[in-house]
């Protein structure tokens, strides 16, 4: 089953992601962006569990290899950043667990490729425009809301999940 | 269930100044922004401003800096609203709105409004 | 400051009608693949709700009846087929720049 603390601590790594702002988000209005959040891919109808926990995976995965790069460690508090990190590797190694657990119990593909391959292309899109703006605080600040919103659609999907046990 | 609960009606003298609060529960008072909003009667709506009260970080409307002061008590998850030097045209209802959907800035749920009526 | 200027200020439309309203803004509140307008709807004695935001989503727990559209300075809310329930004023509100502003707001009656 994919445990509660897994949603708790996702909770909590939204809660440190919100006191990590060092900005005012008002003064950085003129530099939102649509990074194209692949919301279907959150959508837990439409797959099987152990697919499910593979997207939930790659997006934290993908989550923590952005926070964990140099430009991230100059843009954040660093005690912070440090709870933010142990915090998503801790649901990392969560998901795993649960995969290994779901594996023998589905006869499905362990990957949703498609899915696998949305989440990529959208933190793509997100480095690409950091580098754009030149890892600006703005850019930053931009960028710490689009993962609160994207770590809240992985929190539903979750709870999606959760359902169906 | 997310719940914002404000004060009572007021009523006040021209020159005085007022303070009203919005009780939250329900969710997490300090991660969301809490937007302030006038409606005078019969008339639309007008944003104040917005506060942090996990910082305590505050942005006015221009038109509102002198007049509205936004501060937000997070052990007592509550937001307060001061308005000074009132006047007639402060008469109106005074919403407090959670912020939602994060840097989209749109407004989710809302208080029921506390009615300040100036008056001599 | 952005000025919406909402069109008509009240319509009357009959039971299972299209009610169309209109927001123009002063200004585009359009910018990278985002339109920042959002949609109220206010009945007598309540408080405003969330119906749509980013000119075309539909917010959680709204009927599907209600649809926004529009980019840059020009954005429809459409009410097809409209319900008795659906009689009340309804608001734009941009955040696309500071300070953030509402329409004058459009008062729907039902025939």
């Known amino acids: 089953d994919l445990p509660q603390t897994h949603s708790l601590g996702n909770r909590r790594a939204l809660i440190l992601l919100a006191q990590m702002g060092r900005i005012s988000p008002f003064s950085c209005l003129k530099d939102r962006r649509d990074f194209g959040l692949p919301q279907e891919e959150f959508d837990g109808n439409q797959f099987q569990k152990t697919q499910a926990i593979s997207v939930l995976h790659e997006m934290i995965q993908q989550t923590f290899n952005l926070f964990s790069t140099e430009d991230s460690s100059a843009a954040w508090e660093q005690s912070l950043l440090e709870k933010f990190s142990t915090e998503l590797y801790q649901q990392l190694n969560n998901l795993e667990a649960c995969v290994i657990q779901e594996v023998g119990m589905e006869e499905t593909p362990l990957m949703n490729e498609d899915s696998i391959l949305a989440v990529r292309k959208y933190f793509q899109r997100i480095t690409l425009y950091l580098t754009e703006k030149k890892y600006s605080p703005c850019a930053w600040e931009v960028v710490r809301a689009e993962i609160m919103r994207s770590l809240s659609f992985s929190t539903n999907l979750q709870k999606r999940l959760r359902r169906k046990d | 269930q997310v719940q914002l609960q404000e004060s009572g009606t007021v009523l006040a003298r021209p020159g005085a100044s007022v303070k009203m609060s919005c009780k939250a529960s329900?969710?997490?008072?300090?991660?969301?922004?809490m937007h302030w909003v006038k409606q005078r009667p019969g008339q639309g709506l007008e944003w104040i401003g917005v506060?942090?009260?996990?910082?305590?970080?505050?942005t006015y409307n221009q038109k509102f800096k002198d007049k509205a002061k936004l501060t937000a008590v997070t052990s007592a998850n509550t937001a307060y609203m001061e308005l000074s030097s009132l006047t007639n045209e402060d008469s109106a209802v005074y919403f407090c709105?959670?912020?939602?959907?994060?840097?989209?800035?749109?407004?989710?749920?809302w208080g029921q409004g506390t009615t300040v009526t100036v008056s001599s | 400051d952005i000025v919406l200027t909402q069109s008509p200020a009240s319509l009357a439309v009959s039971l299972g009608q299209r009610a169309t309203i209109s927001c123009r803004a002063s200004?585009?509140?359009?910018?990278?693949?985002?339109?920042?307008m959002h949609w109220y709807q206010q009945k007598p004695g309540q408080t405003p709700k969330l119906l749509i935001y980013?000119?075309?989503n539909l917010e959680s727990g709204v009927p599907a009846r209600f649809s926004g559209s529009g980019s840059g300075t020009d954005f429809t809310l459409n009410i097809h087929p409209v319900e008795e329930e659906d009689a009340a004023t309804y608001y734009c509100?941009?955040?696309?720049?500071?300070?953030?502003?509402f329409g004058s707001g459009t008062k729907l009656e039902i025939k």
């Open positions: 506060i942090y009260p996990g910082n305590g970080d505050t």
């Open positions: 980013l000119a075309s």
């Open positions: 200004k585009s509140v359009s910018t990278s693949g985002h339109s920042y």
């Open positions: 509100q941009h955040s696309g720049e500071l300070p953030f502003t």
């Open positions: 709105t959670r912020n939602y959907k994060y840097d989209y800035y749109t407004m989710d749920y």
């Open positions: 329900g969710y997490s008072f300090t991660t969301y922004w």
